[in-house]
Amino acid sequence: LTCLGGFASPGPVPPSTALRELIEELVNITQNQKAPLCNGSMVWSINLTAGMYCAALESLINVSGCSAIEKTQRMLSGFCPHKVSAGQFSSLHVRDTKIEVAQFVKDLLLHLKKLFREGQFN
């Protein structure tokens, strides 16, 4: 984690900086949203607990052709210790609940901001 997340600047970045950058990207997405995000695509809801970065990536990676979340997908991969590919599902998915990408991003953003405030970066 300490080596990832810094897309704007080269070299290692602290985990807190990586998380701040991810939050800022999610803020950009929510603020710049005009038409429905990713054409209203639906993704699996996730439990916002330990391991949620991989779970979030597993959900979002199944959305293709949506440039608005490509940077988020890349950033999330920096928080997930294993390689994630489309069709992969973790136990953290709420498999009977699908939500719009816009709502997924909003829920994730809220949770990440609280993690940042509480100093939980891993």
């Epitope: 807190s16 809220l110 901001k113 609280k114 100093g119």
Partner: antibody
Framework: EVQLVESGGGLVQPGGSLRLSCTGS????????IHWVRQAPGKGLEWIGR????????KYDPKFQGRFTISADNAKNSLYLQMNSLRAEDTAVYYC?????????????WGQGTLVTVSS | DIQMTQSPSSLSASVGDRVTITCRSS???????????LEWYQQKPGKAPKLLIY???NRFSGVPSRFSGSGSGTDFTLTISSLQPEDFATYYC?????????FGGGTKVEIK
């Protein structure tokens, strides 16, 4: 318009219990943290604790842990402070306050306060 | 727990005076996320506190420019550059970096 309104204060005997309420309007309590702060007559401000209503993550000042319990009812957009084994020194105005919603950097809205008097 | 020590506990000043209030924390209040959650609140009798300054030096929306905050590490200052009649009140510093969060004891600014 964002508002916090406390209620439930009043006169209680030493050893008694009281539950204070704080109801939010104009925002969703799950989107932020809510704190309880008190102020004894003529004294300074004291932070009691806070709750994240999204997940019931609660933190207290250790001096209040055990006697005071913070909880939330998201459906009612309300917070509670349950106070047990009350003592004369718990006499104070009790405020709820919310952390601002962007980065939770500070308390941007406070309730008007509710007075609790512990006396026989 | 982190103690926040404010000084002076009270002061008398006249309209137009420059007023400085200091707040010292018993240990560093730099949060693990890099921020320093040091705030200043103003309180008038019978009213809830109002935010003036957050994260050491950021003026809250609507707060007059005569209020400024500075400091780092463990030493922080609130300055009122030219005291106005509506500024007579009690001022509290507050650290929101480490739980339990703590307030300073307050500084009462009175009319000379």
């Amino acid at each position: 318009e964002v508002q916090l309104v406390e209620s439930g204060g009043g006169l209680v005997q030493p050893g008694g219990s009281l539950r204070l309420s704080c109801t939010g309007s104009g925002f969703n309590i799950k989107d932020t943290y809510i704190h309880w702060v008190r102020q004894a007559p003529g004294k300074g401000l004291e932070w009691i604790g806070r709750i994240d209503p999204a997940n019931d993550n609660i933190k207290y000042d250790p001096k209040f842990q055990g006697r005071f319990t913070i909880s939330a009812d998201n459906a009612k957009n309300s917070l509670y402070l349950q106070m047990n084994s009350l003592r004369a020194e718990d006499t104070a105005v009790y405020y709820c306050a919310r952390s601002e919603e962007n980065w939770y950097d500070f308390f941007d809205y406070w309730g008007q306060g509710t007075l609790v008097t512990v006396s026989s | 727990d982190i103690q926040m020590t404010q000084s002076p506990s009270s002061l008398s000043a006249s309209v137009g005076d420059r007023v400085t209030i200091t707040c010292r924390s018993s240990q560093s209040i730099v949060h693990s996320n890099g921020n320093t959650y040091l705030e200043w609140y103003q309180q008038k009798p019978g009213k809830a506190p109002k935010l003036l300054i957050y994260k050491v030096s950021n003026r809250f929306s609507g707060v007059p420019s005569r209020f400024s905050g500075s400091g780092s590490g463990t030493d922080f200052t609130l300055t009122i550059s030219s005291l106005q009649p509506e500024d007579f009140a009690t001022y509290y510093c507050f650290q929101g970096s480490h739980i339990p969060y703590t307030f300073g004891g307050g500084t009462k600014v009175e009319i000379k």
